[in-house]
């Protein structure tokens, strides 16, 4: 470790006297830092010796020798004060720039360490400090304002009391820079916008900064718009806002339009669009199937999808028949607005009854005019089965009818014994039924179908069951013929 | 809900000294300057000094230096105050009010106490 | 120290109308576009209560009917419209530099 003469760690002089500072080290030695033109420098062997004729105030500082070769990066310091009566103060740099939160040295050096017990921070012309300023002094250093915040950019003088007056150092100019997180926060207003020919529309884009130095334009397509902006300072952030106002737009006024702000961290854009039309319109859409088909009991939900400008003006949900003059509820209907000009509107059909079938539609009006849009709602029903014993052209027949939707398929099964219902170790015989015949096929009801099943002679010991199936389920009737004519079994529930 | 409880009323005599104390419940304690300030009928709001509860660091006004002491209890997040040598000039209602520590530079009292009133008097 | 001074010392406003009471400073409590001057609300037998801080920030739970504006040397409270509850007196305070000040407080009443 190198070694200074004379010793320090401080070295009091009075301006005029000569001043030798010698660093002597195992190896080469030198001095950091760059030394002003007032001080002789040269080499003496393995030390370096730094020397001047007429100390000055403004030789006030720390010197600091390091020996280079040295592994431990070792390095010897000697302060040296030079006691100007008149300039109690040296200032080793009129600008001081920091980021928010740090520590901020404001470099004036005491040039009299008498006088650290009056030395004070004040802001230029003996302001006093900002409130809740928290600073330290040094006197190898000068004053050191802890964790700077962005409002105590000063200009600022240290002051020190000399006989019984305050005596002012030159100013130091703290500049604290904001943190800059990123590029400016942006919104851009509406998301979109839809404007018939001939109405006002106003676009505004603003952006928003930690600092004031950054940047913001609207761009239409590809054309950067000239716009005067409006600035303002709030919750500690700079806003910048562009107001486009047209008066009647037109189709030119169409198009992309794009806010852009940028600082030094970079650049935030956001987008929107802008649809200019000749007259007021109104779509009704669904991603529905508008013919549906719900099992008897379960529900279902309509769904209908609105673009509309201008606004809607009314809406409902209608029961058009054909069974009751029911009309929903209205606590069943529910609209959610996706953005500005889209609408979705449900209806909720819980649990449906049979008198629930048909058809319902969403009627909307705009000053386009209305729209309507009609879903039709068929119920699905498991099929109903019955049997009866007759004659027809003279001959035993068995008629089953069978009542379902979708319309029922029938199968005639023939087992032996006497049973409810005829399992598949009794079977005899199968018959299936290709084109039972059509009784009735009502628009939203059952379809009714007859099925025949011709029989010469019955046996007695067996027993015929129709069976009826669609897509909901299955339903079934058992026939026993007996010697005073015949009986009939629904199948057991 | 935040609160700043006073210590109740004080009658005391001249020459005497008072310490009234300030409760912070629902608040970090040491986010917030704890703040004095004087009313009294005749000089409206007067600003005493504060304290910052992190490392009991005291700003005074000068007018009140000599008379007011401010200590803080962080363990019971209690601000106090004293008044020393007590005359009929410091008959008035005593308010502890918070002011925020942050990076933000606004420092405005955004709690105050219910006020504790002391009357000088022989 | 900073001296506030503020004007006038009472008033009396209608129900619904304006009110507009003013803070000026001794020097300017300005700095890199902060203004840091703030309004309280006093009833009586009650505390102040912060409404507006740095000049025209809404403290939280505060109406809309409260407003703030000024720069530098002048500053302004706006109540509109005014209502019943808003009788108290009103005052400006200063955190720029120690020691903080206040104004000598406006008188609010409401015809």
């Known amino acids: 470790i190198p070694v200074i003469e004379p010793s320090g760690p401080e070295l009091v002089v009075k301006p005029g006297e000569t001043v030798t500072l010698r660093c002597v080290g195992n190896g080469s030695v030198e001095w950091d830092g760059p030394i002003s033109p007032h001080w002789t420098l040269y080499s003496d062997g393995p030390s370096s010796v730094l020397t001047t004729n007429n100390a000055t105030f403004q030789n006030t500082r720390t010197y600091r020798c390091t020996e280079p070769g040295d592994p431990l990066g070792g390095s010897a310091a000697i302060h040296l004060y030079v006691k100007d009566p008149a300039r109690p103060w040296n200032v080793l740099a009129k600008e001081v720039v920091v980021f928010e939160d740090q520590d901020a040295l404001l470099p004036c050096l005491l040039t009299d360490p008498v006088l650290e017990a009056g030395v004070s921070l004040v802001r230029l012309r003996g302001r006093p400090l900002l409130r809740h300023t928290n600073y330290s002094f040094s006197p190898w250093h000068g004053f050191i304002i802890h964790r700077a915040k962005f409002i105590q950019g000063q200009d600022y003088q240290c002051s020190a009391l000399m006989g019984g007056r305050k005596v002012m150092s030159i100013s130091i100019r703290l500049k604290v820079q904001k943190v800059i997180p990123g590029p400016p926060a942006l919104t851009l207003v509406p998301a979109e916008l839809v404007r018939i020919r001939g109405e006002a529309a106003q676009i505004v884009c603003s952006a928003s900064n930690i600092d004031v130095d950054f940047d913001v334009f609207l761009q239409h397509n590809t054309t950067k718009l000239a716009i005067p902006q409006r600035s303002d300072f709030h919750d500690n952030r700079y806003q910048k806002v562009l107001t486009l106002s047209l008066g009647q737009v037109d189709f030119q006024h169409a198009g992309n339009y794009s806010c852009v702000a940028s600082n030094v961290q970079g650049k935030h854009s956001t987008s929107m669009f802008f649809q200019v039309v000749e007259s007021a319109y109104l779509d009704l859409s669904s991603e529905q199937n508008l013919i549906q088909e719900v099992t008897v009991g379960e529900g279902l939900n309509l769904k209908v999808m609105v673009e509309a400008y201008p606004g809607l003006q009314g809406f409902n949900w209608t029961y058009l028949g054909p069974f009751s003059d029911h009309q929903p509820e209205p606590k069943l209907a529910n609209a959610t607005t996706k953005d500005t000009y889209r609408h979705t509107f449900t209806l909720s059909l819980p649990r449906l009854k049979p008198s629930e079938a048909g058809r319902y539609s969403f009627l909307a009006r705009n000053p386009g005019g209305w729209r309507a849009l009609t879903f039709e709602l068929t119920l699905r029903y498991p099929p109903e089965v019955s049997v009866i014993w007759t004659s027809i052209n003279g001959s035993g027949t068995l008629l089953c009818a069978a009542s379902g939707y979708p319309q029922p398929n029938v199968t005639w099964l023939q087992c032996a014994g006497h049973t409810d219902r005829c399992d598949e170790a009794q079977v005899l015989q199968v018959w299936v039924d290709p084109h039972p015949e059509v009784l009735s096929q009502e628009p939203f009801q059952k379809v009714t179908v007859q099925s025949l099943l011709t029989a010469e002679t019955l046996e007695h010991n067996q027993t015929y069951e129709c069976r009826a199936h669609n897509s909901v389920g299955s339903g079934s009737w058992a026939f026993i013929p007996i010697s005073a004519g015949a009986r009939t079994h629904p199948p057991d529930e | 809900e935040v609160q700043l409880q006073q210590s109740g009323p004080e009658l005391v005599k001249p020459g005497a000294s008072v310490k009234i104390s300030c409760k912070a419940s629902a608040i970090t304690f040491t986010d917030y300057y704890m703040n004095w300030v004087k009313q009294s009928p005749g000089k409206g709001l007067e600003w005493i000094g504060d304290?910052?509860?992190?490392?009991?660091?005291?700003t005074y006004n000068q007018k009140f230096k000599g008379k007011a002491t401010l200590t803080v209890d962080k363990s019971s997040t209690t601000a106090y105050m004293e008044l020393r040598s007590l005359t009929s000039e410091d008959s008035a209602v005593y308010y502890c009010?918070?002011?925020?520590?942050?990076?933000?530079?606004?420092?405005?009292?955004?709690?105050w106490g219910q006020g504790t009133s002391v009357t000088v008097s022989s | 120290d900073i001296v506030l001074t503020q004007s006038p010392a009472s008033l009396a406003v209608s129900l619904g109308q304006r009110a507009t009471i003013s803070c000026r400073a001794s020097e300017s409590v300005s700095s890199h576009d902060i203004h840091l001057m703030h309004w309280y609300q006093q009833k009586p037998g009650q505390s102040p209560k912060l409404l507006i801080y740095a000049a025209s920030n809404l403290e939280s739970g505060v109406p809309a009917r409260f407003s703030g504006s000024g720069s530098a040397t002048d500053f302004t409270l706006n109540i509109h419209p005014v209502e019943e509850e808003d009788a108290a007196t009103y005052f400006c305070q200063q955190s720029i530099e120690d020691p903080p000040t206040f104004g000598g407080g406006t008188k609010l009443e409401i015809k």
């Open positions: 304290i910052n509860p992190n490392n009991g660091g005291t």
């Open positions: 009010a918070r002011e925020k520590i942050s990076m933000e530079y606004y420092y405005a009292m955004d709690y």
